[in-house]
């Protein structure tokens, strides 16, 4: 079990380093200072990392690897890793401009035990913690991940960087510094401190290696006060207690001369009350402070290390696994631990909620809810079951007017209306030819029960969609075989859409022939011959007239002339509305005068009665 103290600690402070170090002093510390995180410049930048309703806060994870190999953050962070504290809670203000987001306090510090490699790769992740009323506690999600490769000498100044991840921008600084007694650009040389700190004047560091003095002179930052400043790294200026400023020339306070401790102020002549180095206990996490001649030293409790015991060397005893994860290993400080995460969570500390809804387990448009311990599907109306897989009878009690049929599906009843009707319940009259449904030059005929398409030769289908020979002759030949220019062209209706008119002797079939000749006084007719129950696709001798542009035989689209649109050139022709057992073979004497003159794609109204049983619309 995790003690209340420790569990509170884990939720507020640095939580883990993925490579766990023993409680020996590290050779040095990589420090990362996040300056800002927010929407980047340019369009499409996000307004806020929080959802509109829930407050959230940010935290950061840094992963360091030696060399110049950028790798996934999940692979070992061989130089170390650290997690920041949680930042202040942020709630999006509707309408407010997108701000730079409130950040966690303090540095991210990654101690390294061995030599600083000089070249390293970093990965910095920005995480969002949503603080709503989710079941199972807060939800974590990765907002941005930036990575880079850098050369960096230990002991150098802060390096500034700006990285962009998608629409987010992260500004930060970083440096590597050695922890005494290590010195040098790789923190590999060791010096033993003497009783007094170095003064910046002569520039020689008064510390010796374990055998002899460190050879290289140490030059502090130019202008560093020789009385109140000292340095441990080249170019540095660190102040004695009671002094501040970039060159250690500003006393911390001049309001009191009561304290006997501290250097004399040049301006007031009284002693500046320099607080003792252990005042306020700078050692975090229960560390005990002891003063040294130069500063202070923290003795850290088990599981923590660093100058101020601020870095957590987490083991299973510290309860590092979130969300009910099972911790394995890590019994001694030198060994890492592994979290075995429960369903719905992942990450080295089970801190990442798995988006199991991304697999779209809910069928039929159901809404997926990941509750952490389980998935739930909120089904649309008309569906039920754990995954909304059961289609309820949404047509029950629903009526579709005018011969429409109710179609189940989609959670709401839908009427498939009979031709000539539309609307939700098929109560609205519709002009079936208005949408120009007949393709490839087919003529649309509207009648009381819907429409029929009269296809141009060489086309089939209820809407003339299928060219019989798509690689055949190109559009609009001068005259099809067997016809002279100026002769009417013949169109054959799909047989199932034919119109048979019963008249005369019982069993005899009559065919309505619409002979249309615009601008001509003579009429053509039709002699009808019986045929097989369904027509061959080569029913007409002049079926080579495809009345279309070349469809193309390759891949992709090939545009065709829109023969459903009124054209300026209107070929004259005979429209044969046939029954399944009748073919038009040749033109002979007229039966009927023309009924209507129209253009391709326009509706032609049949202005005569006929029994509905004869019309079949597939």
């Amino acid at each position: 079990m995790v003690s209340p103290r420790m569990s509170g600690l884990l939720s507020q402070t640095v939580i883990l380093a993925l490579i766990f170090l023993p409680q020996t002093r590290p050779a040095g510390v990589f420090e990362l200072q996040i300056h800002s995180f927010g929407p980047g410049p340019g369009p499409g930048a996000p307004r806020s990392p929080c959802s509109a309703r829930l407050p959230c806060r940010l935290f950061f994870r840094v992963c360091l690897k030696p060399g110049l190999s950028e790798e996934a953050a999940e692979s070992p962070c061989a130089l170390g890793a650290a997690l920041s504290a949680r930042g202040p809670v942020y709630t999006e203000q509707p309408g407010a401009p997108a701000p730079d987001l409130p950040l966690p306090d303090g540095l991210l510090q990654v101690p390294f035990r061995d030599a600083w490699p000089g070249t390293f790769s970093f990965i910095i992740e920005t995480w969002r913690e949503e603080l709503g009323d989710q079941i199972g506690g807060p939800a974590w999600s990765l907002l941005a991940r930036v990575a880079g490769r850098r050369r960096l000498a230990a002991g150098g100044p802060w390096a500034r960087d700006i990285q962009r991840a998608g629409a987010w921008e992260l500004r930060f600084s970083y440096r590597a510094r050695c922890e005494p007694p290590a010195v040098g650009t790789a923190c590999t040389r060791l010096c033993r401190p003497r009783s007094a700190p170095s003064r910046c004047g002569p520039g020689l560091r008064p510390c010796a290696p374990l055998e002899d003095e460190c050879e290289a002179p140490l030059v502090c930052r130019a202008g560093c006060s020789p009385e109140h400043g000292f340095c441990e790294q080249p170019g540095e200026c660190r102040c004695l207690e009671g002094w501040t400023g970039p060159l250690c020339t500003v006393p911390v306070s001049t309001s009191s001369c009561l304290s006997p401790r501290g250097p004399s102020s040049a301006t007031t002549g009284c002693l500046v009350p320099g607080p003792g180095p252990c005042d306020g206990n700078p050692c975090a996490n229960g560390g005990s402070c002891s003063e040294t001649p130069r500063s202070f030293e923290c003795t850290c409790p088990r599981g923590f290390y660093g100058l101020r015991c601020e870095v957590s060397g987490v083991t299973c005893a510290d309860g590092p696994c979130f969300n009910g994860g099972l911790c394995v290993g890590g019994a001694d400080p030198d060994s890492a631990y592994i979290c075995h995460c429960p369903p719905g969570f992942q990450g080295s500390n089970c801190e990442k909620r798995v988006d199991r809804c991304s697999l779209q387990p809910c069928r039929n448009g159901g809404l997926c809810l990941d509750l952490g311990h389980a998935l739930r599907c909120r089904c649309r109306a008309g569906f039920a079951g754990p995954r909304c897989e059961h289609d309820l009878d949404d047509c029950a009690g629903r009526a579709c007017a005018n011969g429409g049929t109710c179609v189940e599906g989609g959670g709401a009843h839908r009427c498939s209306c009979a031709l000539g009707f539309g609307g939700r319940d098929c109560r609205e009259r519709a002009d079936p030819c208005a949408a120009r449904p007949c393709a490839h030059g087919g003529r649309c005929y509207a009648h009381f029960s819907g429409l029929v398409c009269a296809c141009a030769p060489g086309y089939m289908g209820a809407r003339c969609e299928f060219p019989v020979h798509p690689d055949g002759a190109s559009a609009l030949p001068a005259a099809p075989p067997g016809l002279r220019p100026g002769d009417p062209q013949r169109y054959l209706l799909p047989p199932a859409l034919g119109l048979l008119v019963a008249a005369g002797v019982a069993g005899a079939a009559l065919l309505l022939v619409h002979v249309r000749r615009r601008g001509h006084s003579q009429d053509a007719g039709s002699r009808l011959l019986a045929g097989t129950p369904e027509p061959s696709v080569h029913a007409l001798p002049d079926a080579l007239n495809n009345l279309r542009t070349q469809e193309g035989s390759g891949d992709g689209p090939s545009s065709s002339v829109d023969w459903n649109r009124p054209e300026d050139v209107d070929p004259q022709g005979i429209y044969v509305i046939s029954a399944p057992s009748i073919y038009a073979r040749e033109v002979a004497t007229p039966l009927f005068p023309p009924l209507h003159t129209g253009r391709a794609g326009q509706r032609q109204h049949l202005l005569f009665p006929y029994p509905s049983s004869i019309l079949s619309v597939k």
Partner: nanobody, 119 residues
Framework: EVQLVESGGGLVQPGGSLTLSCVAS????????MGWYRRAPGKQRELVAG???????VYSDSVKGRFTISRDNAKNSVYLQMNSLRAEDTAVYYC?????????????WGQGTLVTVSS
């Protein structure tokens, strides 16, 4: 742009069966027709079977009674069940997609899948 991907072709003995599948993706439309065409060696491409958006079907005389076309609108797919296959059915079979959007018509073809009927 509509992409068509056919599958199911292969080598089959006379009298055997195959099912071809075609999936349309991209800018598909509800007002469409889908079908199967074939091109035998040395011949031009010809319609085998087609099915309109309302389910109406057409077949060529040579396959009537042996082939069955069907479609799954939810999956934007069309299928051709081929039974009692003959040597003369050997051809490259192409999926066809015809759509009409706002009065503009467009035809699309797949790459083709080879069906070989041989003993």
């Amino acid at each position: 742009e509509v992409q068509l991907v056919e599958s199911g072709g292969g080598l089959v003995q006379p009298g055997g069966s195959l099912t071809l599948s075609c999936v349309a993706s991209g800018s598909t439309s509800s007002r469409n027709a889908m079908g199967w065409y074939r091109r035998a060696p040395g011949k031009q491409r010809e319609l085998v079977a087609g099915i309109s958006s309302n389910g109406s079907k057409v077949y060529s005389d040579s396959v009537k009674g042996r082939f069955t076309i069907s479609r799954d609108n939810a999956k934007n797919s069309v299928y051709l069940q081929m039974n009692s296959l003959r040597a003369e059915d050997t051809a490259v079979y192409y999926c066809y997609y015809f759509r009409t959007v706002s009065g503009s018509s467009m035809s699309y073809w797949g790459q083709g899948t080879l069906v070989t009927v041989s003993s």
